[in-house]
């Protein structure tokens, strides 16, 4: 991959600090369903234990069937820092629901990320920013806390913080969808 | 209003060299990633190279590898594409385009340049 | 990489017509597709992203559908100003890739 180093606050394509981003619909503009692994090819799988469910990041048999996950894309208000409207294009939000009534949310106090039974609308904590990077993997940033992204740490997910000076390749934070 | 003014186009000889460039404002130029399309006389739209502003990836259409270097200078709100080893299979309109989204490539490109003109012939 | 076949690759028709123009992927997924409409001598325009949204500014006779490999572009009662090629591209996976192009000329 190329480098190209250009290192103002958010040159980086994270969303500006302090910005608040505001849900342009209610409903989401198109879902999928897809299977996650990390950057690594590990599976990220989901157990009902004990009435809640965990979250595992794990190689996977060769027959055993990877857990979809629903992604739900919304559409976001990008503020603006330079252009006189206030507003400067879109971003895509998504939600990501691997059971019926379950969403994956952010923990900003533990650090971690947790599944979450809710009915909508679903709090801030359930949308993350999506990043297109490294040409076919994808990153998920925190709604609720600028530059902290989902990502891979102990074979569990937590929330990782991403200094905006760094590049965002990190593979801890690159995960890959499958359709198929 | 967005606009986006390419320059740099014209007529050189197999071999040569050339640099593209495109102007970009009206929006936040380095939240969003950036790309060259082309589009050879008669033909359809060709994706050459983009640019995205996280970590500064790159791509680039096999045709082109080793030839053309895409990059930016976010102060001066610009993309480039400078173009080597030209072939006459390189003669195309030169289009430079925003992505819709600014983390995301998946709603392809709102707005495009008017295009400049590359020939390669002797 | 997504290989995207458009047909027909050119269509007569009279203004208040009803034009559709579909786009077939080599391998499907699930509705990152755009539809762009371009004149000649100018730039592509954005019509239609994720498949079935409208760009801002774009007129409501023109409609998307579709996913997995099986995509269409839909332009009711025609106008003259709808005259032009209309390419789509798959926005999914890199590379992003184009159809072949699609003329609507005047019968």
């Known amino acids: 991959m190329g480098s190209s180093h250009h290192h103002h606050h958010h040159s980086s394509g994270l969303v500006p600090r302090g910005s608040h981003m505001s849900i342009t619909g209610i409903s989401p503009i198109t879902e999928s369903l897809a299977s996650l692994s990390t950057y690594n090819d590990q599976s990220i799988t989901f157990a009902l234990e004990d009435e809640s469910y965990e979250i595992y990041v794990e190689d996977l048999k060769k027959d055993k069937k990877k857990d979809k996950v629903l992604l739900s894309y919304y559409e976001s208000q990008h503020p603006s820092s330079e252009s006189g409207d206030g507003v400067d294009g879109k971003m895509l939000m998504v939600t990501l629901s691997p059971t019926k009534d379950f969403w994956l949310q952010a923990n900003n106090k533990e650090h971690s990320v947790e599944l979450h039974k809710c009915e909508k609308p679903l709090p801030d904590q359930a949308f993350f920013v999506l990043h297109n990077r490294s040409f076919n993997c994808v990153s998920f940033e925190c709604k609720t806390d600028p530059g902290v992204f989902i990502g891979v740490k102990d074979n569990h997910l937590a929330l990782i913080k991403v200094d905006y000076s760094e590049n965002l390749g990190s593979e801890n934070i690159l995960f890959k969808l499958s359709e198929t | 209003e967005v606009q986006l003014v390419e320059s740099g186009g014209g007529l050189v000889q197999p071999g040569g060299s050339l640099r593209l460039s495109c102007a970009a404002s009206?929006?936040?130029?380095?939240?969003?990633?950036m790309s060259w399309v082309r589009q050879a006389p008669g033909k359809g739209l060709e994706l050459v190279s983009d640019?995205?502003?996280?970590?500064?990836?790159?791509y680039y259409a096999d045709s082109v590898k080793g030839r053309l270097t895409i990059s930016r200078d976010n102060s001066k709100n610009t993309l480039y594409l400078q173009m080597n080893s030209l072939r006459a299979e390189d003669t195309a309109v030169y289009y430079c385009?925003?992505?819709?989204?600014?983390?995301?490539?998946?709603?392809?490109?709102?707005?495009w340049g008017q295009g400049t003109l590359v020939t390669v012939s002797s | 990489d997504i290989q995207m076949t458009q047909s027909p690759s050119s269509v007569s028709a009279s203004v208040g017509d009803r034009v559709t123009i579909t786009c077939r992927a080599s391998?499907?997924?699930?509705?990152?597709l755009a539809w762009y409409q371009q004149k000649p001598g100018k730039a592509p325009k954005l019509l239609i992203y994720a498949a079935s949204s409208l760009q801002s500014g774009v007129p409501s006779r023109f409609s998307g559908s579709g996913s997995g490999t099986d995509f269409t572009l839909t332009i009711t009662n025609l106008q003259p100003e709808d005259f032009a090629t209309y390419y789509c591209q798959q926005a999914n996976s890199f590379p992003l890739t184009f159809g072949g192009g699609t003329k609507v000329e005047i019968k």
């Open positions: 385009a925003k992505s819709h989204y600014s983390t995301s490539w998946f709603g392809g490109f709102d707005y």
């Open positions: 009206g929006f936040t130029f380095r939240s969003f990633a």
């Open positions: 391998q499907g997924f699930s509705s990152w």
């Open positions: 640019l995205r502003t996280s970590g500064g990836s790159t």
